[in-house]
């Protein structure tokens, strides 16, 4: 039987009566366009919804758009579309909803063909009020709020121009011409490449890179001959042309651009692209393309400088630049990332590393299911997940693999058991560990969503016909019950729960059809009457992470330390509550060389943990760039991963030599930095 | 193989406080919980409370909740239960059991390595 | 805490006989159930874990079945040393056994 239909499910007592209770529905007499949906803030109960309408007439387009806002998690909504005095919304800029709880919304309003500049409405209310203000400019991408302070914006224009807001775009001032691409960086920073001849795309490779500090009074160019850069954790990326060729190569630099080094990676050809696939403070995943049109790569691992790099991961999945790659970071446990990757055969197979991209191995078969058609041999496969590029190639696929930091070691995704990826329907899968252990959660594809902090997982089928019917867990997908939420069917367009997981509110979204109208309808569920009581101490158990051997010493040792977490039992039904913090125990673990990454010019043989020297450069001394000089390293071989945290045991000796021997592309060296003044 | 050894028997007054110990010899102790069970003469199997001796997380059951405190030493490999306020109820068998472990859930695998008992007796 | 109600209180049997035991617990507490055997004077001994999981060690006439609220442990043939009490312990909350169930000689 599929799950939750065994007799060993305990049911939640009288949950129809509770949810009936606990069901709103909302109605919008719009034409049926595009809905989005945005939350202001957080623990706010504040929605922003915008239904738009096109209809392409001969020599123009008729638009309309509604502002609906909810209070309440979606509850009610009022219509506040007069607010922005009936204006057309242009939805390829969204909603622009400020950093943390600044209460900031910004909403680019289309404007006639001959106006001097673009239009927005800000509010800094939760979206009580609005203001209208005609910019200067025609923007070309969405208002950019500074992370640290959201008074500050930053937008681009269709000219190309950097303009900057320090009072919340009430006034606007273009710092730049012939900007390409602007981020901001950390401390009110801004980065963003410059173009000298023609345009963006014809000065590709001969980009200049220039950083201010204080919004535009003053400027530094950081580097030229750029490509492109991005800012991943404490790391500023910069892909740099070579001299001679039309090779580029990466270059990092750690305190904001003053210095730069030359990562060790493959350099790369015109056709191929580097990719930041995930960054924290402590290292960085990198993708770097393969040569031809593969449709793979490498995945590279970091130092904590982000110079060294180790090879993780080969024939990485990564269809083009921009294109589709399935690098997941599960963040329900640290550690864990879950990608494809392209075998020989051309199948498509997913691999997970469990620490930080050591190592990587296919996914544990789940209990009691059977392998695919695409099994050689029927006793032996593995969980393959649909992650985007089974998305963008238009599987049955509604969603990407979903986990959340405060519902430890959940991870829900569709998948298919075999060899590899299938294109047949595929099945939801669920893992309490963090994706040690799998068990098929639902038959066929679903939507799905975690409240509460895990206490709560609500699931819709997908499916082309009307739907009526969700489903909901309250012990981590091993039993459901199901609830009717209107007796008129709809036909779905989304799911919506509050980001971060600890609602206990969702949104169902869809159109209702009838011979000669069609409405946009929302049903806001609140499950809070299904978790009647607060969780107590004797509703969590403790659990060890990453355990997979109790008789090892180090038994869930994991970049250096093992960590206990207070975990929810799957047979208590309590709210964890909005204010729920993850309770965990760390213990340090003793070194070992599974703590040290391979240093520059070594190399792990396969199922092997020493680091052996790289053939090519045995006899040879090592050097290598760093801040733009040439180091002589005197390893063994090893350097500590970083974010490791053990202490004691294996203890590698390593030692780095300064050359003062220049060696990076000079265009980066400080030398020829210049400072600039407006 | 792993053994469990309990310290011997003790004969206490109403009032007073008992410390049994348990030391675990073969094994990683500090990987596994330890639970104590006790049981009265005639009577059945009572949880009191568990600890993980690495990191010294501890969990008693309701009724014992204040009066029982479980520690455990991970540098000897020994667990300790003491019990305070004694009164004659309390006269029993007292076992130190591990819980068995198949993943990373401490207590949900049933309790494979015991004690050999430690007699308790509160009589004025 | 969850209440654990085995049946029956006591039980009389013959050496070759087949003895079923059965666990009651007051909510779901999924398959998180042991079963143990315990002889006079000596601790208890760890027969089956999550519900059907026999210990390594116990012989395979132990056999254990049922999972949510509904549990029985079941000796397909009776020997001489399998007379004795036993408990069922459930896991999924603060630790609760059952009452026990002693199999006597007929």
């Known amino acids: 039987s599929a799950p939750g239909e065994d007799e060993e499910c305990g049911r939640v007592r009288d949950f129809v009566a509770k949810l009936a209770n606990n069901t709103h529905q909302h109605v919008a007499d719009d034409l049926r366009g595009s809905v989005s949906l945005s939350w202001v803030g957080d623990s706010t109960g504040v929605i922003l919804v915008l239904t738009t309408f096109h209809v392409p007439l001969v020599i123009m387009t008729f638009g309309q758009s509604k502002l609906y806002r909810s209070e309440d998690y979606g509850k009610n909504f009022k219509d506040i579309t007069d607010l922005i005095n009936n204006t057309f919304i242009r939805t390829e800029f969204g909603m622009a909803i400020g950093p943390e709880n600044s209460g900031k919304v910004v909403l680019t309003a289309e404007v006639s063909g001959g106006s001097r500049g673009g239009r927005i409405f800000r509010s800094s209310d939760f979206a009580k009020n609005f203001v209208q203000t005609d910019l200067p400019f025609h923007p070309l991408t969405q208002m950019m709020y500074s992370p640290q302070n959201s008074d500050y914006l930053l937008a681009l224009s269709t000219e190309n121009g950097l303009w900057v807001s320090k009072n919340f775009g009430g006034k606007w001032e273009e710092i730049h011409k012939a900007v390409c691409l602007a981020k901001w960086g950390s401390d009110n920073t801004i980065f963003f490449t410059t173009y000298a001849n023609g345009s963006c795309k014809a000065d590709l490779g001969a980009l200049e890179l220039w950083r201010t500090s204080d919004l535009g009074k003053s400027f530094k160019t950081i580097g030229v001959k750029i490509y492109s850069f991005g800012l991943g954790g404490r790391f500023l990326f910069a892909s740099v042309m070579a001299d001679k060729d039309t090779t580029r190569r990466i270059h990092v630099s750690t305190d904001q651009g003053d210095t730069w080094s030359m990562a060790q990676l493959p350099s790369v050809g015109q056709e191929q692209f580097y990719s930041i696939l995930a960054a924290n403070d402590d290292m960085v995943f990198m993708h770097v393309d393969e040569p031809g049109d593969t449709g793979f790569g490498t995945i590279f691992t970091s130092d904590d400088r982000g110079i060294v790099y180790s090879k993780s991961l080969d024939r990485h999945l990564y269809t083009t630049t921009g294109g589709e790659t399935d690098f997941t970071n599960v963040t329900s446990l640290r550690g864990v990332y879950i990608t494809s990757v392209l075998s020989e055969d051309n199948s498509i197979q997913t691999m997970i590393t469990f620490d930080q991209g050591g190592r990587w191995t296919h996914l544990r078969k789940p209990e009691n299911s059977e392998c695919d058609a695409t099994a050689k041999n029927k006793n032996e496969c593995s969980l393959h997940i649909h992650a985007s590029y089974s998305i963008s190639q238009k599987l049955n696929v509604p969603m990407a693999p979903l986990s959340e930091p405060n519902a430890v070691g959940i991870v829900i995704a569709h998948g298919s058991v075999g060899d590899a990826i299938s294109v047949m329907v595929p099945d939801v899968y669920i893992s309490d560990d963090g994706g040690y252990s799998w068990t098929k959660m639902l038959e066929g594809p679903h939507y799905y969503t975690i409240l509460d902090s895990g206490g709560i997982i609500v699931a819709i089928e997908h499916s082309s016909r009307p739907i009526n019917v969700i489903k909901f867990s309250t012990d981590e997908g091993q039993c459901w019950q199901t609830y009717t939420f209107t007796r008129d069917p709809i036909y779905f367009t989304g799911l919506a729960s509050e980001p971060g997981a600890r609602s206990m509110n969702i949104s169902i979204w869809g159109f209702t059809e009838s011979f000669l109208t069609s409405q946009w309808v929302s049903y806001t569920i609140d499950f809070k009457d299904i978790l009647e009581r607060n969780c107590e101490e004797k509703d969590y158990t403790i659990w060890l992470a990453h355990s997979t051997d109790p008789e090892d010493y180090e038994d869930g040792c994991i970049l250096g330390y093992k960590e206990q977490f207070l975990r929810l039992r799957k047979s208590s039904v309590c709210q964890n509550g909005r204010d729920y913090v993850v309770t965990k125990q760390p213990s340090i673990c003793l070194c070992s060389l599974e703590d040290f990454l391979c240093d520059f010019g070594y190399y792990r043989p396969e199922n092997d943990s020493k680091c052996v020297e790289q053939p090519e450069l045995k006899g040879h001394d090592l050097e290598f760039c760093l801040y733009g000089r040439e180091e002589h390293l005197t390893t063994n071989g090893y350097r500590k991963i970083p974010g490791d945290k053990c202490q004691g045991g294996v203890n590698p000796v390593r030692e780095v030599k300064d050359l003062k021997k220049k060696c990076t592309s000079n265009f980066l060296s400080p030398e020829k930095q210049n400072s600039k003044s407006n | 193989q792993v053994q469990l050894v309990q310290s011997g028997a003790e004969v206490k007054k109403p009032g007073s406080s008992v410390k049994v110990s348990c030391k675990a010899s073969?094994?990683?102790?500090?990987?596994?919980?330890i639970s104590w069970v006790r049981q009265a003469p005639g009577q059945g199997l009572e949880w009191m409370g568990g600890?993980?001796?690495?990191?010294?997380?501890?969990n008693y059951a309701q009724k014992f909740q204040g009066r029982v405190t479980i520690t455990a030493d991970e540098s000897t490999s020994t667990a300790y239960m003491e019990l305070s306020s004694l009164r004659s109820e309390d006269t029993a068998v007292y076992y130190c059991?591990?819980?068995?472990?198949?993943?990373?859930?401490?207590?949900?695998?049933?309790?494979?390595?015991w004690g050999q008992g430690t007699t308790v007796t509160v009589s004025s | 805490d969850i209440q654990m109600t085995q049946s029956p209180s006591t039980l009389s049997a013959s050496v070759g006989d087949r003895v079923t035991i059965t666990c009651r617990a007051s909510?779901?507490?999924?398959?998180?159930l042991a079963w143990y055997q315990q002889k006079p004077g000596k601790a208890p001994k760890l027969l089956i874990y999550?519900?059907?999981s026999l210990e390594s060690g116990v012989p395979s006439r132990f056999s254990g079945s049922g999972s949510g609220t509904e549990f029985t442990l079941t000796i397909s043939s009776l020997q001489p040393d399998d007379f004795a009490t036993y408990y069922c312990?459930?896991?999924?909350?603060?630790?609760?056994f059952g009452g026990g169930t002693k199999v006597e000689i007929k």
């Open positions: 059991a591990r819980q068995g472990r198949k993943t990373g859930y401490y207590y949900y695998y049933g309790m494979d390595v």
């Open positions: 073969g094994g990683t102790f500090r990987n596994y919980a």
């Open positions: 600890i993980i001796p690495i990191g010294g997380w501890a």
């Open positions: 909510q779901s507490i999924s398959s998180w």
């Open positions: 999550k519900a059907s």
């Open positions: 312990q459930q896991a999924d909350g603060h630790i609760t």
